[in-house]
Interface confidence: medium
């Protein structure tokens, strides 16, 4: 059979025999448009498409709606893959979302959602999640039901305040909600009592800013 040369996600790349983690070129569904993504081919069986990573504060996440739409940063380091690509991809088939978190004391935890997708831009890339398991809290730190995405120039939250401007970063803010993995990156020893940091409330509480986060997706039937 003819060898596959374009891939929609890292799971397809993994199944094609390319099983080394790294940066790969993905193609938008039903399009020739391409995007660079980091593929984790080792964790939990591999085939994970990394859609977000924070690790050192090297990239500014207080970006515009358009930047969150198309993506920004460096796939080998801190980056946001892009809402439009993720929306298109997750509406093609069923995906799981795994969020891996690290604190400053050497602990790690994760939240796994058995079904994840983003609505279209017309619906403000609203997040849809079902079936939470994992070690980063029994309650979802992404408010349920899912909220619209908000940025500093696109306020779609449920607060009279502007959550994205107040807490920084684009996120699925409620009012403003128990998480924001795109907040300010505070270094160790400055990471407590910070309301606008990298927050996952049901693991570390409201004022704790995390050391590292990774959001990754994979087809549910992988």
């Amino acid at each position: 059979k003819e060898e596959q040369t374009t891939f929609r996600d890292c799971a397809e790349i993994f199944k094609s025999g390319l099983t080394t983690s790294g940066i790969y070129t993905l193609t938008f569904p039903n399009s020739t448009e391409e995007i660079k993504a980091y593929c984790d081919m080792e964790a939990g069986g591999g085939g994970w498409t990394i859609i977000q990573r924070r690790e050192d504060g090297s990239v500014d996440f207080q970006r515009t709606w358009k930047e969150y739409k198309v993506g920004f940063g460096n796939p080998s380091g801190e980056y946001w893959l892009g809402n439009e690509f993720v929306s298109q991809l997750t509406n093609q088939q069923r995906y799981v979302l795994k969020i891996h978190l690290k604190d400053w004391e050497g602990n790690e935890a994760y939240s796994l959602y058995e079904h994840f997708y983003l609505s279209s831009e017309e619906l403000n890339y609203r997040i849809h999640l079902k079936g939470l398991t994992g070690t980063a809290g029994k309650i979802s730190s992404i408010s349920q039901p899912g909220n619209d995405f908000s940025t500093k120039d696109g306020d779609n939250d449920k607060c009279i305040c502007k959550c994205s401007q107040m807490l920084t970063g684009g996120w699925w803010f409620d009012a403003c909600g128990p998480s924001n993995l795109n907040g300010m990156y505070y270094p160790q020893r400055q990471n407590t009592n910070k309301f606008n940091g990298i927050k996952w409330y049901y693991w570390k509480g409201s004022g704790y800013s995390l050391k590292a986060t990774t959001m990754m997706i994979r087809p549910a039937d992988f």
Partner: antibody
Framework: QVQLVQSGAEVTKPGASVKVSCKAS????????MYWVRQAPGQGLEWMGW????????NYAQKFQGRVTMTRDTSISTAYMELSRLRSDDSPVYYC??????????????WGQGTLVTVSS | EIVMTQSPATLSVSPGDRATLSCRAS??????FAWYQQKPGQAPRLLIY???TRATGIPARFSGSGSGTEFTLTISSLQSEDFAVYYC????????FGQGTKVEFK
């Protein structure tokens, strides 16, 4: 009383490395983080990174990632800062400074006397 | 990074005068803020931390105020030993310093 005594002035060539030491006395060395700050002639102060003398854990400023290494020897209460691949603009005075020890990870209450590094071919 | 802007760059005053130095942060740093004094050929010396708390051994003529983005260092009656360069520093989000204010003889 608390004292931080740094090694003497260094003259080195571009592309080489320099290692500056900072010997602490008058307090428990492992109880306070040690920071490194540099200052070009007539210029302001620039934070480079810190080391936790207790664990050896470090935190480097983005600008110096990959070029700076901070270590310590607890047996002689000494912290070290090594800067590699030196350029001509790496010629300021380098200071070690002790963290005040409060939770906010903040002000530097005691400083070394400074070490002048000259990078010249 | 948070940018710290000091003003004025140079302040010409006479001994016994009151000196007021300002520092502005590009975003809020709460009260995680300090002032340092530096004399030629010497290391900086911590004067004020937490925006308004005097460090050990610092005379009462030095006082600090402000929070958020605007901070002030006041020297109520300048002594000859106070002529130096003064730096502000935030330690809220990483660590950055202002470019300094030189207090010189008028």
């Amino acid at each position: 009383q608390v004292q931080l005594v740094q090694s003497g002035a260094e003259v080195t060539k571009p592309g080489a490395s320099v290692k500056v030491s900072c010997k602490a006395s008058g307090y428990t060395f492992t109880a306070y983080h040690m920071y490194w700050v540099r200052q070009a002639p007539g210029q302001g102060l620039e934070w480079m990174g810190w080391i936790n003398p207790n664990s050896g854990g470090t935190n480097y400023a983005q600008k110096f990632q990959g070029r700076v290494t901070m270590t310590r020897d607890t047996s002689i209460s000494t912290a070290y800062m090594e800067l590699s691949r030196l350029r001509s603009d790496d010629s300021p005075v380098y200071y070690c400074a002790r963290d005040q020890g409060i939770a906010a990870a903040g002000p530097f209450d005691y400083w070394g006397q400074g070490t002048l590094v000259t990078v010249s071919s | 990074e948070i940018v710290m802007t000091q003003s004025p760059a140079t302040l010409s005053v006479s001994p016994g005068d009151r000196a007021t130095l300002s520092c502005r942060a590009s975003q809020s740093v709460s009260s995680n803020f300090a002032w340092y004094q530096q004399k030629p050929g010497q290391a900086p010396r911590l004067l004020i931390y937490g925006s308004s708390t005097r460090a050990t051994g610092i005379p009462a003529r030095f006082s600090g105020s402000g929070s958020g983005t605007e901070f002030t260092l006041t020297i109520s009656s300048l002594q000859s030993e106070d002529f130096a360069v003064y730096y502000c520093q935030q330690y809220h989000y990483w660590w950055t310093f202002g470019q300094g204010t030189k207090v010189e003889f008028k």
